[in-house]
């Protein structure tokens, strides 16, 4: 499994954002898939469950991404995105994606910094 | 086999409200985000509404905002797009697609004239 | 908005010519572009996303490249049956935004 993400992000406090996240794989995508969100402040302190998918998405019951996270992947198009919306500044840090896809092997975890800012500066 | 089956167009007059609906079948409905797009008389094709799966967090473009509202029943396996105040550029052939446009239905024609 | 700006507007050609449609973003749309086939009479149907993917079921003829702000759509050897309109679509950024469409014909 190869996975690709954007890498680094900027987004507006307030504003929704989607974390994107798309992989390849030799195996074809079936109930075995699985994908795991986690989250580690940019300040240090432990990794945070974000989100799990397998069949169908789990959003977290509890903590700091209750009722502000949904899933917005396709398996068919390899896409295991999330929408994390009303953004904070501390949610700044890195959030992480996990896919298996067995029987493919386990790839690397993608990762996307993202930082939470006031405004987006134009840049066009 | 993905299906996405809708329903509900017609002739309305201007200021006039309607409802559209959307069967979904063939898919696990719950696990994605839908969208509503239209195509005018002219096949020009635009975006109007779309609802994330979980809470149903929802986004419109400017054109529509306020006036119409997407909404979904997942026990139903059944989309919605509730259109008020109507205008005569709503007229067009109304989508309903699955996630970000991978399975689009057959449509249904919305016409808004006095 | 972000404008998908799509050329050209018609395209006749012969059964076996390659074809390439060009779309143009206002601003980067990184490679959230997808291509859209709409034949006589029906309804949209995804050819590639992501910039470059094929969607399930789509023959390899259909191509897709581009990153940022320009992107290509080709069609490797024309067939009869590919007589029908073609959109680019950006999902970058709501409100997700429309090429004009390209109308390919068969000679």
């Known amino acids: 499994v190869e996975i690709y993400t954007s890498g680094a992000l900027e987004a507006v406090n307030g504003t929704d954002v989607r974390l994107k996240c798309t992989f390849s794989s030799f195996a074809p995508v079936g109930d075995a898939l699985t994908v795991t969100w986690n989250f580690r402040p940019r300040d240090g302190g432990r990794e945070q469950f974000v989100f799990y998918y397998h069949m169908d998405p789990f959003r977290p019951m509890s903590g700091r991404f209750k009722d502000r996270v949904v899933w917005d992947g396709n398996p068919e198009r390899y896409d295991v995105s999330i929408l994390l919306w009303k953004l904070q500044f501390d949610d700044n840090g890195t959030y992480t994606c996990q896919v298996k896809n067995p029987p493919d092997v386990d790839g690397l975890v993608g990762t996307i910094r993202l930082s939470v800012v006031h405004t987006v500066p134009f840049s066009e | 086999e993905v299906k996405l089956v809708e329903s509900g167009g017609g002739l309305v007059q201007p200021g006039g409200s309607l409802k559209l609906s959307c069967a979904a079948s063939?898919?696990?409905?719950?696990?994605?985000?839908m969208s509503w797009v239209r195509q005018t008389p002219e096949k020009r094709l635009e975006w109007v509404a779309y609802i994330t799966t979980g809470a149903g967090r929802t986004y419109y473009p400017d054109t529509v905002k306020g006036r119409f509202t997407i909404s979904r029943d997942n026990a139903k396996n059944t989309l919605y797009l509730q259109m008020s105040s109507l205008k005569s550029e709503d007229t067009a052939m109304y989508y309903c697609a699955r996630h970000r446009g991978d399975y689009w239905g057959q449509g249904t024609s919305v016409t808004v004239s006095s | 908005s972000i404008v998908m700006t799509q050329t050209p507007k018609f395209l006749l050609v012969s059964a076996g010519d390659r074809v390439t449609i060009t779309c143009k973003a206002s601003?980067?749309?990184?490679?959230?572009v997808a291509w859209y086939q709409q034949k006589p009479g029906q309804s949209p149907k995804l050819l590639i996303y992501?910039?470059?993917n094929r969607f399930t079921g789509v023959p390899d003829r259909f191509t897709g490249s581009g990153y940022g702000t320009d992107f290509t759509f080709t069609i490797s050897t024309v067939q009869a049956e590919d007589l029908a309109v073609y959109f680019c679509q950006q999902d970058y950024s709501s409100p997700w935004t429309f090429g004009g469409g390209t109308k390919l014909e068969i000679k």
């Open positions: 992501y910039a470059s």
């Open positions: 601003q980067s749309v990184s490679n959230d």
């Open positions: 063939g898919f696990t409905f719950s696990s994605y985000t």
